[in-house]
């Protein structure tokens, strides 16, 4: 009974289409598959950024796979052929591994790369990224930002840079159509007359870096002798009401400070009849139903009641 063997896939490679971290892994079928014409051969692919503890593993019948990587680090991948048990009258047969690696050939010493890169998607409408020049660069150094997400034909360069002392230190992005809930890739590279500049790569999803506007139209309503309802409206803009969490800060007679986090645009506060003054502010953040993370908005304008009995007056800012 001869042992059944199968070769690993051929021409296994990692291809960089210029999408700043979104790479293609591709291969060709193994040699000598003639004996297994009736078989659907599968491939087990493992890949990771070099230094990562864990491999991502997929099993596919295709000859390609695409995924995002951190180009600040190298990438390693390996693949082998799988013959299902149906093809071999017994147990599954695996080939040896074919392996490949890929990394951007980096330039420049670490003091040349940008520092403190920070991107915020204001009100789910306007993306702004800012950075500081590398600690060791001269004023002749300029940085360029490129970005890509699935849906763009190719990586685009920023067209509206924020400048300081003639150097690019940020980018205001144009309207980004259908760009959320998918990886957004950025590369900041640079040029200088006297030294190569280290590129930096960043990946995030836009819905996770949203900073909303603060809530508006804060009001008080007396619900009963010992309850006051605080109300506000969702911030203006495209973010739906179901996507908000709120944090309220309430100050009663300049002493008691109450803070609370709520999901709705109301909050009921227990008070005493002696309450002479009541002030509150609210801020908003995108909640876990719409994103994995987010940034608190600025606080709203303060809304205060003082003097008159709240039962006689409902205040609107």
């Amino acid at each position: 009974d001869t042992e059944i063997k199968v070769n690993p896939p051929q021409d296994f490679e990692i291809v960089d289409p210029g999408y700043l971290g979104y790479l293609y892994l591709q291969w060709q079928p193994p040699l000598s598959l003639d004996h297994f014409k009736e078989c659907t051969v599968e491939y087990e692919l493992k890949y990771r950024n070099i230094g990562s503890e864990t491999w991502k593993t997929i099993i596919t019948k295709n000859l390609h796979y695409k995924d995002g990587f951190d180009l600040n680090k190298g990438i390693e991948a390996k693949i082998h052929t799988l013959l299902p048990w149906q093809c071999t009258n017994g147990s599954e047969v695996q080939s040896s591994w074919a392996e490949t690696t890929y990394w951007i050939s980096p330039q420049g010493i670490p003091e040349t790369k940008v520092q403190d890169m920070d991107c915020v998607y204001y009100n789910w409408q306007y993306l702004l990224c800012s950075w500081k020049p590398g600690i060791g660069v001269l004023l002749d150094t300029n940085y360029n930002l490129f970005y890509w997400y699935e849906g763009l034909d190719h990586a685009l360069q920023c067209v509206d840079y924020i400048k300081a002392d003639g150097q690019n230190i940020g980018c205001r992005f144009p309207y980004l159509e259908a760009s959320d809930y998918k990886d957004f890739y950025i590369c900041v590279n640079g040029s200088s007359e006297n030294k190569p500049i280290r590129s930096s790569y960043f990946t995030f999803q836009l819905q996770n870096i949203v900073k909303p506007l603060p809530p508006v139209y804060l009001t008080f309503t007396r619900e009963s002798s010992c309850e006051i309802k605080l109300k506000w409206s969702i911030p203006l803009g495209p973010i739906p009401a179901r996507c908000f969490d709120y944090e309220i800060e309430i100050r009663e007679d300049d002493t008691t400070l109450v803070t609370a986090t709520v999901e709705n645009e109301t909050y009921t506060l227990k008070t005493t009849n002696e309450t002479r003054q009541l002030c509150f502010v609210v801020r908003s953040k995108v909640n876990i139903y719409c994103s994995d993370d987010g940034i608190w908005s600025e606080w709203s304008d303060k809304q205060c009641w003082e003097g008159e009995d709240l039962s006689k007056k409902t205040l609107l800012r």
């Epitope: 950024n49 990394w103 420049g108 010493i109 001269l138």
Partner: antibody, heavy 118, light 107 residues
């Protein structure tokens, strides 16, 4: 010829401070950063931090934050490192070192020996 | 911080012998590695940068190789003036970190 000339040996008491200098010549001082490296007796090298003489920007090894302060005097093309609250652990040879455009390090000072002893 | 593990810590070798010193980084450092030689009472001297590029004026018996996390310095035929301590340095990211050193002595 590029030269990095460091100040002479120092003997100081615990708790005191010391300021080591690194006078440069043979190149434009503001066109390259300056790094400082510590070598304890019979031990390896430790990177302390970097300063950009052009704008005074610094980056420190976390281990030396609060211990070392890097400064420059552009007029004399000199870099300085001040070490404070000295203990015997700070006894070492300290080097200034300059990178090239592509790597660390192109030029080194001759080293300054610091001895902390009561 | 990136840890650089250098080996051996010391070694004895004969003149004319081929000598190899290794450095392993705790993560991929993308060939941002320099090798230095230091003699007693002297400042370190750079021999190799970017893992395999020889500094001008350094004898061609010195060579560097490696990628990812693993790097080595080789002296193809040891000469007397090569005695000293050798250090690797990663400069992929701050803080820069050195290996613990390899003391090379004559057998």
């Amino acid at each position: 010829e590029v030269q990095l000339q460091q100040s002479g040996p120092e003997l100081v008491k615990p708790g005191a401070s010391v300021k080591i200098s690194c006078k440069t010549s043979g190149y434009t001082f503001t066109e390259y950063t300056m790094h400082w490296v510590k070598q304890s007796h019979g031990k390896s090298l430790e990177w302390i931090g970097i300063i950009n003489p052009n704008n005074g920007g610094t980056n420190y090894n976390q281990k030396f934050k609060g211990k070392a302060t890097l400064t420059v005097d552009k007029s004399s093309s000199t870099a300085y490192m001040e070490l404070r609250s000295l203990t015997s652990e700070d006894s070492a040879v300290y080097y200034c070192a300059r990178p090239s455009a592509t790597h660390y390090f192109d030029y080194w000072g001759q080293g300054t020996t610091l001895t902390v002893s009561s | 911080d990136i840890k650089m593990t250098q080996s051996p810590s010391s070694m004895y070798a004969s003149l004319g012998e081929r000598v190899t010193i290794t450095c392993k980084a705790s993560q991929d450092i993308k060939s941002y590695l320099s090798w230095f030689q230091q003699k007693p009472g002297k400042s370190p001297k750079t021999l190799i940068y970017r893992a395999n590029r020889l500094v001008d004026g350094v004898p061609s018996r010195f060579s560097g190789s490696g990628s990812g996390q693993d790097y080595s310095l080789t002296i193809s035929s040891l000469e007397y003036e090569d005695m000293g301590i050798y250090y690797c340095l990663q400069y992929d990211e701050f803080p820069l970190t050195f290996g613990a050193g390899t003391k090379l002595e004559l057998k």
